[in-house]
C-alpha cells in the first residue's frame, strides 16, 4: 500500500495548562523506518517526538507504538504553554543502511494556537 | 455554487483607512477557513492573511502586521479586512479565498476588488 | 520562509503545443503544491493540488507532477483557453503560504 501520512486537524486551540492531542495516521508502515514529530520546517525545526523509545517531557505517544500493525501516531502534550505554539509535523523516515535516516514522507501539519487560561 | 464578492476598494491617499468586505455564499461560511491575497499592478500574488472558521486563529503577513486587521461575522457571512496606514505598495488588487477544509490552498476565489493608494 | 521559483517568466508557444512549466522549492515541500491559472477579469482558479491531483472540472490536458523540491505542470495540447498566467503555491511551510512568481504563457 502507497505510503500516505496524515495529519486530519489543520490547527487546534488549547489552552494553556490544558494538554492537547496532535493527531497523525500512515497508510503504511513500509518502508521501515521512524516517524518524528518536529515543530517549524527547515533549520530551525525543533524535534518534539520520536517514536524510538527516547524520554520527551510532556509529549507521550497517544496508542501503544509498539503494537503490530500500529499506525496511530498520534501524540500528547501536556501542560501547554505559549511556547508550544507553532506548527508540528509528523514525518516518517526510511532507515538508511548508515546514519543518517532519511525523510521520505510528511503530514500536512497541525497548528497549535495556545489561547490564555480563561482567569 | 460557491461565490466570494468582494467589495470596498478604492482610491486612497497614503495614511488613510479602507475596509473591504468579502461576502460569502454556497458554503457553510463559519466552517472554513478564510485568507485575502493581493496582487499588485504587473506582480505575482502575495498571501495577506489567513483567519480560522471560529475567527480565533490569525495570521498576518510581515508587510502588513500591525496596518491591517483581518475578522469575519459569521451570522452575516462575510470577511473582512481593516487596512489602516495605507502606503503606495499596497496598491492591488485585493482577493478573498476560501481554503480547503483540509489544507491550506485555496479552492474558491472572489474577482477581486483595487485598492489604489496614491496622493 | 519558503521560496518558490517558477520558470520560464514567459513561455511562447502555438495552439496545441505542449507546455511545461517548472516550479522549484528553496526547501522540501513535500507533495504540498498547488497550481492556479489567472487570466485578466477573471478569479484565479484552482487547477492542481498535491502536486499532481487534479482539482474538480480541470480538463485532463492539465496535469502536475514533482515532489519535495521540484514541480512541473504540463498541458498536454494548449487550446485558446489556456493562454493565461500559472502559479504555484506551497502550503507545507505555513505561514507564511508563498506563491511563485508566475509563468505567462502567450500566443505565439
Known amino acids: 500500500k502507497e505510503l500516505k501520512v496524515t495529519q486530519p486537524e489543520k490547527s487546534v486551540s488549547v489552552a494553556a495548562g490544558d494538554s492537547t492531542v496532535l493527531n497523525c495516521t500512515l497508510t503504511s508502515l513500509l518502508p521501515v523506518g521512524p516517524i518524528k514529530w518536529y515543530r517549524g520546517v527547515g533549520q530551525s525545526r525543533l524535534l518534539i517526538y520520536s517514536f524510538t523509545g527516547e524520554h520527551f517531557p510532556r509529549v507521550t505517544n497517544v496508542s501503544d507504538a509498539t503494537k503490530r500493525n500500529n499506525m496511530d501516531f498520534s501524540i500528547r502534550i501536556s501542560n501547554v504553554t505559549p511556547e508550544d505554539a507553532g506548527t508540528y509535523y509528523c514525518v516518517k523516515f526510511q532507515k538508511g543502511p548508515s546514519e543518517p535516516d532519511t525523510e521520505i514522507q510528511s503530514g500536512g501539519g497541525t497548528e497549535v494556537y495556545v489561547l490564555a487560561k480563561p482567569s | 455554487d460557491v461565490q466570494l464578492v468582494e467589495s470596498g476598494g478604492g482610491v486612497v491617499r497614503p495614511g488613510e483607512s479602507l475596509r473591504l468586505s468579502c461576502a460569502a455564499s454556497?458554503?457553510?461560511?463559519?466552517?472554513?477557513?478564510m485568507n485575502w491575497v493581493r496582487q499588485a499592478p504587473g506582480e505575482g500574488l502575495e498571501w495577506v492573511s489567513l483567519?480560522?472558521?471560529?475567527?480565533?486563529?490569525?495570521y498576518y503577513a510581515d508587510s502588513v502586521k500591525g496596518r491591517f486587521t483581518i475578522s469575519r461575522d459569521n451570522s452575516k457571512n462575510t470577511l473582512y479586512l481593516q487596512m489602516n496606514s495605507l502606503r503606495a505598495e499596497d496598491t492591488a488588487v485585493y482577493y478573498c479565498?476560501?481554503?480547503?477544509?483540509?489544507?491550506?490552498?485555496?479552492?474558491?476565489w472572489g474577482l477581486g476588488t483595487l485598492v489604489t493608494v496614491s496622493s | 520562509e519558503t521560496v518558490l521559483t517558477q520558470s520560464p517568466g514567459t513561455l511562447t508557444l502555438s495552439p496545441g503545443e505542449r507546455a511545461t512549466l517548472s516550479c522549484r522549492a528553496s526547501?522540501?515541500?513535500?507533495?504540498?503544491l498547488a497550481w492556479y491559472q489567472e487570466k485578466p477579469g477573471q478569479a484565479p482558479r484552482l487547477l492542481i493540488y498535491?502536486?499532481?491531483s487534479r482539482a474538480t472540472g480541470v480538463p485532463d490536458r492539465f496535469s502536475g507532477s514533482g515532489s519535495g523540491t521540484e514541480f512541473t505542470l504540463t498541458i498536454s495540447s494548449l487550446q485558446s483557453e489556456d493562454f493565461a498566467v500559472y502559479y504555484c503555491?506551497?502550503?507545507?511551510?505555513?505561514?507564511?503560504?508563498?506563491f511563485g512568481g508566475g509563468t505567462k504563457v502567450e500566443i505565439k
Open positions: 498535491g502536486a499532481s
Open positions: 526547501q522540501s515541500v513535500y507533495t504540498y
Open positions: 483567519i480560522s472558521g471560529s475567527g480565533e486563529i490569525i
Open positions: 503555491q506551497q502550503y507545507y511551510d505555513r505561514p507564511p503560504l508563498t
Open positions: 479565498a476560501k481554503e480547503n477544509n483540509r489544507y491550506r490552498f485555496f479552492d474558491y
Open positions: 454556497g458554503f457553510t461560511f463559519s466552517s472554513y477557513d
